[in-house]
Amino acid sequence: GSVPPMVNVTRSEASEGNITVTCRASSFYPRNITLTWRQDGVSLSHDTQQWGDVLPDGNGTYQTWVATRICQGEEQRFTCYMEHSGNHSTHPVPSGNSHHHHHHHH
């Protein structure tokens, strides 16, 4: 069977006027997962995103991440899209005073 991922979006200061947003998927099985950023619903090009490898997390499941750098103040235009074992979901960037957003998918 499949185990759906826990998806967590975080933000961190990158440089003046920019922030790095990171979308992490964890505790999923099997290992094939789509994780990518969108701006205004349009997929970002590969060359503007950085991906972590899909790695075992020690519990028989996997974890990975994707990150991109965006302009501060434009967070609401960006979403992380996840697709795994026939299920999909989108995840917004948390506002500046809330650093974590996570959800487990069934």
Partner: antibody, heavy 120, light 107 residues
Framework: QVQLKESGPGLVAPSQSLSITCTVS????????VNWVRQPPGQGLEWLGM???????DYNSALKSRLSISKDNSKSQVFLKMNSLQTDDTARYYC??????????????WGAGTTVTVSS | DIQMTQTTFSLSASLGDRVTISCSAS??????LNWYQQRPDGTVKLLIY???TLPSGVPSRFSGSGSGTDYSLTISNLEPEDIASYYC?????????FGGGTKVEIK
């Protein structure tokens, strides 16, 4: 076994619209993206656009104003509609499943294609 | 858009030969490159993805390499079923773009 099969009108008059259906089997459209690619006679391949598992679409900006991609998950069908056809839209039109895993994005299974001729 | 150039439109080789097909991008594409095979009947098949990874079922005589803007596909031991056109495709930037193709024929 993953399969995709295109069906189209064959002949379209100039300025008219084109509708092609891609019927898939062996996988669910809710969990995979489907791409459209075309190939004019004697030329290379051109990516037109794609529809993701959640129904979101990405288009080739050069054709975006004339293109629409949609789907019916329950019928396992993806639809390509292109408006205002001209003779240089004559091509073989393919649908292909997209696999998008981190740094890897590729079209792993293709349909046989359907030939569309734009002529009066 | 990123332009993909395959300078050799067609090449003739003998069965058993080692064949190399080149592809260059108009800018660096960070190994975001795939290769496809199109048979004479129009059937298209994924041959190599992410520069050098072979999908299951693709014979090991096919290999890919490259970096930056320059990439290549090598067939180490040409067989009759390899007679086809070969296309490179980048996905570093949207839209994904293909090279013009290289047709491999038997000498």
């Amino acid at each position: 076994q993953v399969q995709l099969k295109e069906s189209g009108p064959g002949l379209v008059a100039p300025s008219q619209s084109l509708s092609i259906t891609c019927t898939v089997s062996g996988f669910s459209l809710t969990g995979s993206g489907v791409n459209w690619v075309r190939q004019p006679p004697g030329q290379g391949l051109e990516w037109l656009g794609m529809i993701w598992g959640d129904g979101n679409t990405d288009y080739n900006s050069a054709l975006k104003s004339r293109l629409s991609i949609s789907k019916d998950n329950s019928k396992s069908q993806v639809f390509l509609k292109m408006n205002s056809l001209q003779t240089d839209d004559t091509a073989r039109y393919y649908c292909a499943r997209g696999a998008h895993y981190g740094k890897r994005w590729y079209f792993d299974v293709w349909g046989a294609g359907t030939t569309v001729t734009v002529s009066s | 858009d990123i332009q993909m150039t395959q300078t050799t439109f067609s090449l003739s080789a003998s069965l058993g030969d080692r064949v190399t097909i080149s592809c260059s991008a108009s800018q660096g594409i960070n190994n975001y490159l795939n290769w496809y095979q199109q048979r004479p009947d129009g059937t298209v098949k994924l041959l190599i993805y992410y520069t050098s990874t072979l999908p299951s079922g693709v014979p090991s005589r096919f290999s890919g390499s490259g970096s930056g803007t320059d990439y290549s596909l090598t067939i180490s031991n040409l067989e009759p079923e390899d007679i086809a056109s070969y296309y490179c495709q980048q996905y570093s930037k949207l839209p994904p773009t293909f090279g013009g193709g290289t047709k491999v024929e038997i000498k």
